[in-house]
Amino acid sequence: EGSEREENVEKEGLCNACAWRQNTRYSRIEAIKIQILSKLRLETAPNISKDAIRQLLPRAPPLRELIDQYDVQRDDSSDGSLEDDDYHATTETIITMPTESDFLMQADGKPKCCFFKFSSKIQYNKVVKAQLWIYLRPVKTPTTVFVQILRLIKPMKDGTRYTGIRSLKLDMSPGTGIWQSIDVKTVLQNWLKQPESNLGIEIKALDENGHDLAVTFPGPGEDGLNPFLEVKVTDTPKRSRR
Amino acid sequence: EGSEREENVEKEGLCNACAWRQNTRYSRIEAIKIQILSKLRLETAPNISKDAIRQLLPRAPPLRELIDQYDVQRDDSSDGSLEDDDYHATTETIITMPTESDFLMQADGKPKCCFFKFSSKIQYNKVVKAQLWIYLRPVKTPTTVFVQILRLIKPMKDGTRYTGIRSLKLDMSPGTGIWQSIDVKTVLQNWLKQPESNLGIEIKALDENGHDLAVTFPGPGEDGLNPFLEVKVTDTPKRSRR
Amino acid sequence: DFGLDCDEHSTESRCCRYPLTVDFEAFGWDWIIAPKRYKANYCSGECEFVFLQKYPHTHLVHQANPRGSAGPCCTPTKMSPINMLYFNGKEQIIYGKIPAMVVDRCGCS
Amino acid sequence: DFGLDCDEHSTESRCCRYPLTVDFEAFGWDWIIAPKRYKANYCSGECEFVFLQKYPHTHLVHQANPRGSAGPCCTPTKMSPINMLYFNGKEQIIYGKIPAMVVDRCGCS
């Protein structure tokens, strides 16, 4: 009976050790979570579901690239000394989804694409690259597609509401759709310099029959095929004495 | 019996240690969570469900790129010393989804796409790259698509409400839709410099039959295919004495 | 400049770096697109005498103040950043570097 | 400049870096798109004498102030950032760097 008692105590001790370990681990994780939010300048964790993420996450090469770009752990020749490390996260790439704008309305009241909202934190001279990515739906027969990116402007005397940003001609073959990126660095920089000039853009990708192949408002099965802006920024941290 | 008692005490100690470890782990994690929110300048974790994320997350290359771009852990030639560490996160890429705007309304009162709201924290001169991403729905036959991105402007005397940002011609083949990105860096920089000029954009991607292929408001199964802005910014954190 | 690396099975009582994986999926942070988890690690252990101390003169201070002194604390002496891809809750997906997210080395301080 | 690395099985009692993985999904932070988890690590252990201290002169202070002194604490002496992709709750997905999110080194201070 005595040895049984001892065995029970031993098991209980193991249990306590385990529980203690789990508890401290939990505390560490919680502290890290708080730290992450703080470093990302987030007051709370964004409330977004897995399903919402799946629907939102662009199914485009840049996203796959970012996800693949690092292993579960990566050591990029950093000596990681505490002295030269900043606290807050530094942004390298911003993928911006279009938001609705009162300016971009169709005659039937439906919203048009696309208006991209930008944080004033983004400095125009720090923009290294700005690409507008659009997904062109599949075609059934070989076709030439005319892609036109227009910038919404304040109506001019002649009624002009748009000014062209970029136009390109693509040859598409039957099969799956394709992603196309358009350099919009200058446009973005101007928007950042003069935010009031950012009234939105219009995306057209017309095939030879005038069908618009650009996914601007995803239809069934088109989750993650929204246009989006991929902006790469450069960061030059200033060092400070503590 | 004495040795049995000692064994029991030892076991109990292990149990307690385990429980303690679990508890401190929990505390650490909680602290990290708080820190993350703080560093991201978030008061609370964003209230977004997995489903919402799935719907919102652009299924576009930049997202795939961002997700793939780094390992779960990356050490990018930072010497990471404690002394020079800033607290808040620095943003590198901002993916902005369109929001509704009173300006972008159709005749029937429905919102039009797209208006992108930007934080005043983004400095126009820090924008390295800004891409508007749009998804073009699949076409059934090879077609030429004319993509036009227009910027909404204050109505001019002649009634002009838009100015072109970019126009491009794409050739689309049958199959899946495609993402197209448009460089809107200049536009974005202008918006950031003059936020009042950001009235929204209109995206048109007309095929040869005049059908708009751009997904601006995702329909069924088109989650994640909304247009969005991907902005890459460079951050120059100011160092401060602590 | 070195530090001890331990794991949960280690018998090392001194200040040591232990593995700690932060699994974002495990606690529902779906807004973090990548990484889904990362090795944060942590420092734990005793700081006796001058073991693994970065600035040994701390020891003298403790000698001068024997009572109530908890001694030097086992803390990170080397940290490294991680890159993260995440939704920021503002229709944007951000890819950036978060400094001091991984404990590379632990020490007493 | 060095530190001990331990894990949950370590018997090391001194200030040590322990692995700690922060799993965002585990606690429902779906708004963090990436990473879903990361290794934050943490510092833990006793700070006795000058073991793993980053600023050894703390020891002298303690010697001079015997009463009420908790002694040096096992803390990170080196931190590194992580990159994160997250929804910021304002229709935006942000990719950025969060400094000092990973404990690279722990020490007593």
């Epitope: 996450l57 199914r59 485009a60 796959r64 690239e65 394709i178 196309q180 990126s181 | 795939r64 899946t176 | - | -």
Partner: antibody, heavy 119, light 110 residues
Framework: QVTLKESGPVLVKPTETLTLTCTVS????????ISWVRQAPGKGLEWVGI???????YKASWAKGRLTISKDTSKNQVVLTMTNMDPVDTATYYC?????????????WGQGTLVTVSS | DIVMTQSPATLSLSPGERATLSCTSS????????LSWFQQKPGQPPKLLIY???TLAYGVPSRFSGSGSGTDFTLTISSLQPEDAATYYC??????????FGQGTKVEIK
């Protein structure tokens, strides 16, 4: 017409270096990821590596140190180079559009080229 | 290393029967849905059938369907046709530049 076509030597000696070219038509390599997959005779598919639209390279763990992937967008070509070839590397090598497992990657493949490693 | 296990190794069914192919990953695929199914016939390159675990690829007959999430996935052929005789492979993506194929399931038509 969108096509991918692999080309390169049919026979390679052990320890030698294999160089395969994937020539694409109707594909913009600046917007498209290209993957390499191989298949040993009578065996299953094996992922080799990727060159992303942006030029980043990702390789299977077994291929690290041996594999180089590059591209010349102006020539519409992706080149795979594998050093220190061994008879176990005998396989049909395919290039594919996109990344199999990501979105609709792998929707288009080349016909493959059989490479035999033998002395 | 990641291991993707497909079962059964061979499936022999009659035309019109329902075929159920399984794919199990040693780790959860990225975002629980980075999984595709491919069909390969002798002497031909693989053909994409399903992506995002359950999305039917362009031009693929509706008798093919995919389901599952995380580590366990299923490809179903609701009513086998003679032309469905082939080897089927699952492919998973894990982030960090890690991808893998299953060893394949051979479907034979009796």
């Amino acid at each position: 017409q969108v096509t991918l076509k692999e080309s390169g030597p049919v026979l390679v000696k052990p320890t030698e270096t294999l160089t395969l070219t994937c020539t694409v038509s109707g594909i913009d390599l600046s917007h498209t990821d290209i993957s390499w997959v191989r298949q040993a005779p009578g065996k299953g598919l094996e992922w080799v590596g990727i060159i992303s639209y942006a030029g980043s390279k990702y390789k299977a763990s077994w291929a690290k140190g041996r594999l180089t992937i590059s591209k010349d967008t102006s020539k519409n070509q992706v080149v795979l180079t594998m050093t220190n070839m061994d008879p176990v590397d005998t396989a049909t090598y395919y290039c594919a559009r996109g990344v199999p497992a990501y979105s609709h990657g792998g929707d288009l493949w080349g016909q493959g080229t059989l490479v035999t490693v033998s002395s | 290393d990641i291991v993707m296990t497909q079962s059964p190794a061979t499936l022999s069914l009659s035309p019109g029967e329902r075929a159920t192919l399984s794919c199990t990953s040693s780790q959860s695929v990225y975002h629980a849905n980075w999984l595709s199914w491919f069909q390969q016939k002798p002497g031909q390159p693989p053909k994409l059938l399903i992506y995002w675990a359950s999305t039917l690829a362009y031009g693929v007959p509706s008798r093919f369907s995919g389901s599952g999430s995380g580590t366990d996935f299923t490809l179903t052929i609701s009513s086998l046709q003679p032309e469905d005789a082939a080897t089927y492979y699952c492919a998973g993506g894990y982030g960090g530049g890690r991808y893998a194929f299953g060893q394949g399931t051979k479907v034979e038509i009796k």
